[in-house]
Amino acid sequence: SPTPFGPEGQLADELHKPKAIQTEVKPSVRFNLRTSKDPEHEGCYLSLGHSQPLEDCGFNMTAKTFFIIHGWTMSGIFENWLHKLVSALHTREKDANVVVVDWLPLAHQLYTDAVNNTRVVGHSIARMLDWLQEKDDFSLGNVHLIGYSLGAHVAGYAGNFVKGTVGRITGLDPAGPMFEGADIHKRLSPDDADFVDVLHTYTRSFGLSIGIQMPVGHIDIYPNGGDFQPGCGLNDVLGSMAYGTITEVVKCEHERAVHLFVDSLVNQDKPSFAFQCTDSNRFKKGICLSCRKNRCNSIGYNAKKMRNKRNSKMYLKTRAGMPFRVYHYQMKIHVFSYKNMGEIEPTFYVTLYGTNADSQTLPLEIVERIEQNATNTFLVYTEEDLGDLLKIQLTWEGASQSWYNLWKELRSYLSQPHNPGRELNIRRIRVKSGETQRKLTFCAEDPENTSISPGRELWFRKCRDGWRMKNETSPTVELP
């Protein structure tokens, strides 16, 4: 499709033509103040230097002002998430100004050309903000730029170019190609606003990473490790194999960042929490469910600005759809002994019973091999609020059913033909809730019977000695 003004150079050429031959200049970046929740409403187009539309459309100088910045597009038309985000912002912040930054003419290009256009779009936003700052009562501190994909880097440029410091930039899965590893002035970075929070939902360490992998904000949140999002697998999005393509999976995972942000706006009573961790594997092991020293935070709109944090990587698990919130638990299981285990890797399953609800049977993901005579840490999460935990049912199986494991099991059996039965000895389970930060210890129901064979179950109840309960220092976020 045609580029009316393309990168900065072309725009400059166009503007410096002699008046006589200057073509009609249509702005390639438009600012639409969404004055109504009604999608049919045309809104108000703001124009640099023209104060009348601000007055006519009731621009509130003292209120929060959101600028929503879309990304690269393969269609010349807004994508559906935009309506959801605008609507959610209007619902949550009734007096706020919600401005859609429409740069479709410059975004509906080859990706490389759209990337080259991000700077000029960022500059346009900065100029608009500089002009607004000349008005009485308008404060840059009340400005929140929300950029999706390529739009996140546009927001970065805007924050970099503006006179002063923007209050907040939220990067929703900032684009990866041509930005990964780039200099801080050529991508979104913590210097671009007073607070920069980022959601990463489509990062890949192999193949093309649509979203940027590196941390680029004050806090960088990686839901589900920042890669495979629940509900976005091929089976989930295709409905039936006759319909859809891999493109739908990409869209689902990349766009998930937007929906997580929308969720944080509309489901205020169901906030999702993320936990600081050095990497995804450690988080999967359940090591990082601490709220001490600002190590946890709400995600999305409710995220709290953390002082002195830069590039702080945070992780959480989510549901497949709204509300995305799950309840995280760290489980520490001390395996006292193996009996006749050979080379078999156990796979644990737990069912949690609470005052509000009971969980489904949950597998404990093994990130590293189970250690004997050692405490093994796992992460489990439930979609429902179980309330206070009352008891835990534990079972285990010999191996996950891969050909390699089946071969190991067969080899183990052949080496011990008189295998008298494999057993594990587990006496207690220590549990910590990520959301409440409460710690509990669960003891085997029958202290004399703590051995468990594959397929059998072992029950654990809260230990009698004051439940061995501890509370960590109060988290800095408002936990429910």
Partner: antibody, heavy 119, light 107 residues
């Protein structure tokens, strides 16, 4: 009030092309997307594609991508849909429809243009 | 593409009664669902947008509900002019798709 007025009925031979026009009035033409939807006799409605009249950006249904071209003339506030390599199964009523700001729902429709493809 | 299914091809209801029409999406479309009414020889008419938002000029007896994959159009008290074909349409992702329609006929 918003009005979309389409060109008249067409009879075409297989392999030919047809170009249907849709003149908009009662609103700012460049502020809203324009979409084309067709309906074969007794069939469901089928979205063919849309255009952003502000700068001419288009998106098409893959099913028609190689055969359909949507254009606009902003000075005349008119959108066009051209369908080439016509076959008998393209016999249908073709509608233009004005999208909302986000292009999702269609509150205003043209009266429809009947295109008959017959040898 | 997202497949929209209107399970009832025809629904027979008496005037004055309530009519409930359903529409199912093959995957989650949140609230990006719109309902149209079409009478013979006429263009479709938008009744409900974004699952539940009413349209200016459309009688209050028309209401919509649902989210995700299951949606419902309810006509609280059928009038003679309501007997027509009703289509649902999703705008969650390209290509936009319509259901096959439900014909509402007089019982």
């Amino acid at each position: 009030q918003v009005q979309l007025v389409q060109s008249g009925a067409e009879v075409k031979k297989p392999g030919a092309s047809v170009k249907v026009s849709c003149k908009a009035s009662g609103y700012t033409f460049t502020d809203y997307t324009m979409h084309w939807v067709r309906q074969a006799p007794g069939q469901r409605l089928e979205w063919m594609g849309g255009i952003n009249p502000y700068y001419g950006g288009t998106t098409y249904n893959e099913k028609f991508k190689d055969r359909v071209t949507i254009t606009r003339d902003t000075s005349a506030s008119t959108a066009y849909m051209e369908l080439s390599s016509l076959r008998s199964e393209d016999t249908a009523v073709y509608y233009c429809a004005k999208g909302d700001y986000y292009g999702g729902s269609y509150n205003y429709w043209g009266q429809g243009t009947t295109v008959t493809v017959s040898s | 593409e997202i497949v929209m299914t209107q399970s009832l091809a025809t629904l027979s209801v008496s005037p004055g009664e309530r009519a409930t029409l359903s529409c199912r999406a093959s995957q989650d479309i949140s609230n990006s669902l719109h309902w149209y009414q079409q009478k013979p020889g006429q263009a479709p008419r938008l009744l409900i947008k974004y699952a539940s938002q009413s349209i200016s000029g459309i009688p209050a007896r028309f209401s919509g509900s649902g989210s995700g994959t299951e949606f419902t159009l309810t006509i609280s008290s059928l009038q003679s002019e309501d007997f027509a074909v009703y289509y649902c349409q999703q705008s969650n992702s390209w290509p936009y798709t319509f259901g096959q329609g439900t014909k509402l006929e007089i019982k």
